[in-house]
């Protein structure tokens, strides 16, 4: 009998956020289905997301295992067992990913505003030290874990009353910031990795403003 | 054309084990799907358990816990141990190779029956 119409996989892309990182592809599947497989430059090939009609894989348990590596992965294409097809040895379809360092790559998530405390004309703001996938003596570490001092935040804050921001810099979880008293603020923060040459900054946090149940007030 | 043949059918009685093995006449890429379908008499033919070349295995619901697939890459072998057996799993069980096609084997009959 003849042969299938297997397509190679197309338009692969990583999907990545604090380290949560999905493989997607294309196309939907007809009659085939598809194996991921990953792989460090000098590691071997690891199956995953096997024998599946998904379009998408998550290869989030392998690339936390060490982050700063570059990972490649493949996705193969075979006709679904169903399909009679009978056709000379040949090895199956498969396309490769770009490569992909999450350390380098991973998109930062958007932060939040954990709480901000005034005492008199200072402000403390405290960002949410978000916990990712990435494990090291089996407990999660967090972003501020994994990334050290390349991970800066950047708040941003103005006045109720006015449109007019000011930025602060930090490279912990919280900002001290001078304020007028009797003014209320609201802030804003952005995750920030200087050093980067791709996805740079997050998206910035929801803005909390002073008179809200986050903040707490002190002469 | 890459020939696949399979051995260790018979009849058992229910509740009983068979292994079946498949080997391929050429040397198959750890690249290549290998595995077993069944076809039961009058019906269509069903997958069964799939492997990858490292060893990542699927299951068909009807099978997860009674059977198990194996393979040995360097003998370009595949197994299937069949335990608990019961009638419903009387059926041609065809080995299969899926690289750029699919390659089937012949078939070999399994019986379960008292």
């Known amino acids: 009998s003849g042969t299938t119409n297997t397509v190679a996989a197309y338009n692969l892309t990583w999907k990545s956020t604090n380290f949560k990182t999905i493989l997607e592809w294309e196309p939907k599947p007809v009659n085939q289905v598809y194996t991921v497989q990953i792989s460090t430059k000098s590691g071997d090939w690891k199956s995953k997301c096997f024998y599946t009609t998904d379009t998408e894989c998550d290869l989030t348990d392998e690339i936390v295992k060490d982050v700063k590596q570059t990972y490649l992965a493949r996705v193969f294409s075979y006709p679904a067992g169903n399909v009679e097809s009978t056709g000379s040895a040949g090895e199956p379809l498969y396309e490769n990913s770009p490569e992909f360092t999450p350390y380098l790559e991973t998109n930062l998530g958007q932060p939040t505003i954990q709480s901000f405390e005034q005492v008199g004309t200072k402000v403390n703001v405290t960002v949410e030290d978000e916990r990712t996938l990435v494990r090291r003596n089996n407990t999660f570490l967090s972003l501020r874990d994994v990334f050290g001092k390349d991970l800066i935040y950047t708040l941003y804050y103005w006045k109720s009353s006015s449109s007019g921001k000011k930025t602060a810099k930090t490279n912990t979880n919280e900002f001290l910031i001078d304020v007028d008293k009797g003014e209320n603020y609201c802030f804003s923060v952005q995750a920030v990795i200087p050093s980067r040459t791709v996805n740079r900054k997050s998206t910035d946090s929801p803005v909390e403003c002073m008179g809200q149940e986050k903040g707490e007030f002190r002469e | 054309q890459v020939q696949l043949v399979e051995s260790g059918g018979g009849l058992v009685q229910p509740g009983g084990s068979l292994r079946l093995s498949c080997t391929a006449s050429?040397?198959?890429?750890?690249?290549?799907?290998m595995g077993w379908h069944r076809q039961a008499p009058g019906k269509g033919r069903e997958l069964v358990a799939v492997?990858?070349?490292?060893?990542?295995?699927h299951y068909a619901d009807f099978v997860k816990g009674r059977f198990t697939i194996s393979r040995d890459n360097a003998k370009n072998t595949v197994y299937l141990q069949m335990n608990f057996l019961r009638a419903e799993d009387t059926a041609v069980y065809y080995c299969?190779?899926?690289?750029?096609?699919?390659?089937w084997g012949q078939g070999t009959m399994v019986t379960v029956s008292s």
């Open positions: 299969y190779a899926a690289g750029r096609w699919n390659h």
């Open positions: 050429e040397t198959i890429s750890s690249t290549y799907i």
């Open positions: 492997i990858s070349g490292d060893g990542v295995t």
